[in-house]
C-alpha cells in the first residue's frame, strides 16, 4: 500500500508564438483545478477509460481576473498535493492523465460552469520510495510543470511497497536473518509471512501463507517470467522449464474484481474493468464519491453516498459524458421536424417553424385551409404547408378575390376575336374555323371536322363556350 | 412557456394504486426531464421522482419500491404510479418541469389533491 | 441523503422590513446548487433563487440570495405584502434531492 503524490508547480502559456487568451477575464472571474488518472502499465488508453491505480482532484485554486491587456500569466494554483492511494502493490510503470479544470464563477445560469482547459498524458517508471520526478507536458499553447512521486504507506517498503518493516524489537540490530528497512536504518525488515518460497523479489503478500505475483512473474512463487511466446495453452506461462502454464484454474476464476467489476484475462494475469466510481487493480478504491461535487455543469450525483458505492450524473440537456463535462449541440440531433430552423438558447430550444407548420418542435401539419375561405365559390386545395385556391370560371388570385380577364390567355385559336361574357368568354372565328375555341377547321367541301356545328350556327359564327 | 396539467382520481382506497397523469404544453416533452413532487396537508414538500424522455428515470429512496414513473412522447404526457397506498400517501400531487440549467424546478402545474381513503 | 434545516419556523415581520431566512445543510453542497421557491396558500411553489444566488425569470430584485457549502441565506431586502408566503430550500447537487422544512413569513 502507498500514496501516489501530484505536486503542480506552474499552467500557464508555453514558449514560442501563438501565446494562448488568458481562460479569465473581468467579466468571467475564473479558478483552476486539477484531476489526475492512473493507470498500471504503459497502456495506450483512451481517457475516458478507467483510472484502475485511482484518480484525485484539486482543490479549487485562487480567483483570478484578468488584467486587461496583460498577456496571459501562469495562472493562480490550489494549495496542496494531489494524493492517489493505491492498496496493492505499486506497478513500476504506469500511465496518467492530468487534466487542468477552469471553474467560470460569472453570473453562470444555474452556479457555476467548467471546462476542460488542457489534458496532458504520459506514460512513466517509477520506483516507490524513490526522489520527487520533475516533468513539463505541453496540451497545446499550454505548458504544466509538476512533480510526482510514489511512497509507500508504513509497514510496506520497497520499489513495489511489497516488503513490511516493523520497528526494531532490540536497540542495536535486527533479528536473525532480517535486515534494516532503508531508509527507515531504526527499522527491521519484518519476518516473512509469505508462502515459503514466494519470491522476495517478484512476489508479495498481505495475508500470511499467500503469494500474488507482481507484474511480469508468474508461477505458484512469483518465478517464473512471463513469456507468451512459446505457449500454447490459454492459460499463459508457468512452468519452470518451458515457461508454460498447464492448463488450470485462470486467473479470473472467482472473479477477484470486486464491486462488480468483470474479470477479462491478459497475457500477463488478469485486468479487472470496474463500474463508474471505482478504481483499482481490483475494483477495491472508490476515488471519488458524490460528496466530492464530481458532476459539472448542473449535473445531479447519483449514487455513491460513500466510497463502497460508484456514483453516476444525471446529465442536464445540453451535456453529456460521465461527469456532465462535455456540452452538446442539441441543434446537431435534428430536433426541429418538416425543417424547422433550430436555435439553442441555453436555457432552451427553440425551433422556428416552416410556413404550415406549428408546434414545439414542428410537429404539427396545419390544415392549411382552416379558416382561408376561396371567395366567388373557388375551392381551398391544401399542399405542402400552403393553401390555394381553385377558382371559378372568371376569377382569380391568391383568395378568387380578383375579377379574371378570360381572353387575357388568347384562348381563341386561328385568329379568332376573343369576347369577354358574364357566364366565361366567346370566340368569334375567323373565316374556315369552328368551334369553342375557333380550333376545327372547315373543310372546303361544307362538311365541316367534328364536332359539327350546332343547327342554327353558320361556320364564322361567334359560338359561346358555355 | 411550459403548462403542466395534474388529472387522475381525487380518492384512492387504502392497498390499491394512485395513478396521475401529467400533460405538457408550450414546449417539447423531449427538451426537460419531468418530476413528480407532492405535499402532504399542512406540510412541507417531498420529491417523488424524475424521468427523461429517453426513459431514464431516478426515484426517491424512501418511495423508491413503490413509484413507478413513465412517459408517453406522443401524447406530451408523464405519469405516476404508487402502488399499496395509504392514509400517508394523502397530499397534493404537483408535477413540473427540471431546468436545464440543474435538476430544480422551474414550472409546476397547480397541484391535484389525492386523498386516501377507504 | 443530505438533510436542509430552515430556520427560523416562523418569521414575524411587517411590510418594509427586511427579512433573512436561513438554510443549513447536513453536508456541503456541492456547486452550490441550491434553489429557493415561495408558496402561497392554495398555489404550488414558485422559483426564487437557484444556483444559491441567481434570480430567476421575472423575480423581482428584493430577493437575493447567498451562502456556500452548508450555509444559505434567501433576503428579502423591504417585504412587500405579496411577500408573505412560505419560502423553502432545495439542494440539487445529490440525490435524492431534498427540501428543507419551509419558514413561514408572516404579518406581524
Known amino acids: 500500500a502507498g500514496v501516489f503524490e501530484l505536486q503542480i508547480h506552474s499552467f500557464g502559456p508555453g514558449p514560442g508564438p501563438g501565446a494562448p487568451r488568458s481562460p479569465c477575464s473581468a467579466r468571467l472571474p475564473c479558478r483552476l483545478f486539477f484531476r489526475v488518472c492512473l493507470k498500471p502499465g504503459l497502456s495506450e488508453e483512451a481517457a475516458e477509460s478507467p483510472c484502475a491505480l485511482g484518480a484525485a482532484l484539486s482543490a479549487r485554486g485562487p480567483v483570478y481576473t484578468e488584467q486587461p491587456g496583460a498577456p496571459a500569466p501562469d495562472l493562480p494554483l490550489p494549495d496542496g498535493l494531489l494524493q492517489v492511494p493505491f492498496r496493492d502493490a505499486w506497478p513500476g510503470t504506469f500511465s496518467f492523465i492530468i487534466e487542468t479544470w477552469r471553474e467560470e464563477l460569472g453570473d453562470q445560469i444555474g452556479g457555476p460552469a467548467w471546462s476542460l482547459l488542457a489534458r496532458v498524458a504520459g506514460r512513466r517508471r517509477l520506483a516507490a520510495g524513490g526522489p520527487w520526478a520533475r516533468d513539463i507536458q505541453r496540451a497545446g499553447a499550454w505548458e504544466l510543470r509538476f512533480s510526482y512521486r510514489a511512497r509507500c504507506e508504513p509497514p510496506a517498503v520497497g520499489t513495489a511497497c511489497t516488503r513490511l518493516c516493523r520497528p526494531r524489537s532490540a536497540p542495536s540490530r535486527c533479528g536473525p536473518g532480517l535486515r534494516p528497512c532503508a531508509p527507515l536504518e531504526d527499522e527491521c525488515e519484518a519476518p516473512l509471512v509469505c508462502r515459503a518460497g514466494c519470491s522476495p523479489e517478484h512476489g508479495f503478500c498481505e495475508q500470511p501463507g499467500e503469494c500474488r505475483c507482481l507484474e511480469g512473474w508468474t508461477g505458484p512463487l512469483c518465478t517464473v517470467p512471463v513469456s507468451t511466446s512459446s505457449c500454447l495453452s490459454p492459460r499463459g506461462p508457468s512452468s519452470a522449464t518451458t515457461g508454460c502454464l498447464v492448463p488450470g484454474p485462470g486467473p479470473c476464476d472467482g472473479n477477484p474484481c470486486a464491486n462488480g467489476g468483470s474479470c477479462s484475462e491478459t497475457p500477463r494475469s488478469f485486468e479487472c474493468t470496474c463500474p463508474r466510481g471505482f478504481y483499482g487493480l481490483r475494483c477495491e478504491v472508490s476515488g471519488v464519491t458524490c460528496a466530492d461535487g464530481p458532476c459539472f455543469n448542473g449535473g445531479l450525483c447519483v449514487g455513491g453516498a460513500d466510497p463502497d458505492s460508484a456514483y453516476i450524473c444525471h446529465c442536464p440537456p445540453g451535456f453529456q459524458g460521465s461527469n456532465c463535462e462535455k456540452r452538446v449541440d442539441r441543434c446537431s440531433l435534428q430536433p426541429c421536424r418538416n425543417g424547422g430552423l433550430c436555435l439553442d438558447l441555453g436555457h432552451a430550444l427553440r425551433c422556428r417553424c416552416r410556413a404550415g407548420f406549428a408546434g414545439p418542435r414542428c410537429e404539427h401539419d396545419l390544415d392549411d385551409c382552416a379558416g382561408r375561405a376561396c371567395a366567388n365559390g373557388g375551392t381551398c386545395v391544401e399542399g405542402g404547408g400552403a393553401h390555394r385556391c381553385s377558382c371559378a370560371l372568371g376569377f382569380g388570385g391568391r383568395d378568387c378575390r380578383e375579377r379574371a380577364d378570360p381572353c387575357a390567355a388568347r384562348p381563341c385559336a386561328h385568329g379568332g376575336r376573343c369576347y369577354a361574357h358574364f357566364s366565361g368568354l366567346v370566340c368569334a372565328c375567323a373565316p374556315g374555323y369552328m368551334g369553342a375555341r375557333c380550333e376545327f377547321p372547315v373543310h372546303p367541301d361544307g362538311a365541316s371536322a367534328l364536332p359539327a356545328a350546332p343547327p342554327g350556327l353558320r361556320p364564322g359564327d361567334p359560338q359561346r363556350y358555355l | 412557456q411550459v403548462q403542466l396539467q395534474e388529472s387522475g382520481p381525487g380518492l384512492v382506497k387504502p392497498s390499491e394504486t394512485l395513478s396521475l397523469t401529467c400533460t405538457v404544453s408550450g414546449d417539447s416533452i423531449s427538451s426537460y426531464y419531468w418530476t413528480w413532487i407532492r405535499q402532504p396537508p399542512g406540510k412541507g414538500l417531498e420529491w417523488i421522482g424524475y424521468i427523461y424522455y429517453s426513459g431514464t428515470t431516478n426515484y426517491n429512496p424512501s418511495l423508491k419500491s413503490r413509484v413507478t414513473i413513465s412517459v408517453d412522447t406522443s401524447k406530451s404526457q408523464f405519469s405516476l404510479k404508487l402502488s399499496s397506498v395509504t392514509a400517508a400517501d394523502t397530499a397534493v400531487y404537483y408535477c413540473?418541469?427540471?431546468?436545464?440549467?440543474?435538476?430544480?424546478?422551474?414550472?409546476w402545474g397547480q397541484g391535484t389533491l389525492v386523498t386516501v381513503s377507504s | 441523503e443530505i438533510v436542509l434545516t430552515q430556520s427560523p419556523g416562523t418569521l414575524s415581520l411587517s411590510p418594509g422590513e427586511r427579512a433573512t431566512l436561513s438554510c443549513r445543510a447536513s453536508?456541503?453542497?456541492?456547486?452550490?446548487?441550491l434553489a429557493w421557491y415561495q408558496q402561497k396558500p392554495g398555489q404550488a411553489p414558485r422559483l426564487l433563487i437557484y444556483?444559491?444566488?441567481t434570480r430567476a425569470t421575472g423575480i423581482p430584485d428584493r430577493f437575493s440570495g447567498s451562502g456556500s457549502g452548508t450555509d444559505f441565506t434567501l433576503t428579502i431586502s423591504r417585504l412587500e405584502p405579496e411577500d408573505f408566503a412560505v419560502y423553502y430550500c432545495q439542494q440539487y447537487g445529490t440525490s435524492p434531492l431534498t427540501f428543507g422544512g419551509g419558514t413561514k413569513v408572516e404579518i406581524k
Open positions: 413540473a418541469s427540471i431546468a436545464v440549467r440543474g435538476f430544480f424546478f422551474d414550472y
Open positions: 444556483g444559491a444566488s
Open positions: 453536508q456541503s453542497v456541492s456547486s452550490s446548487y
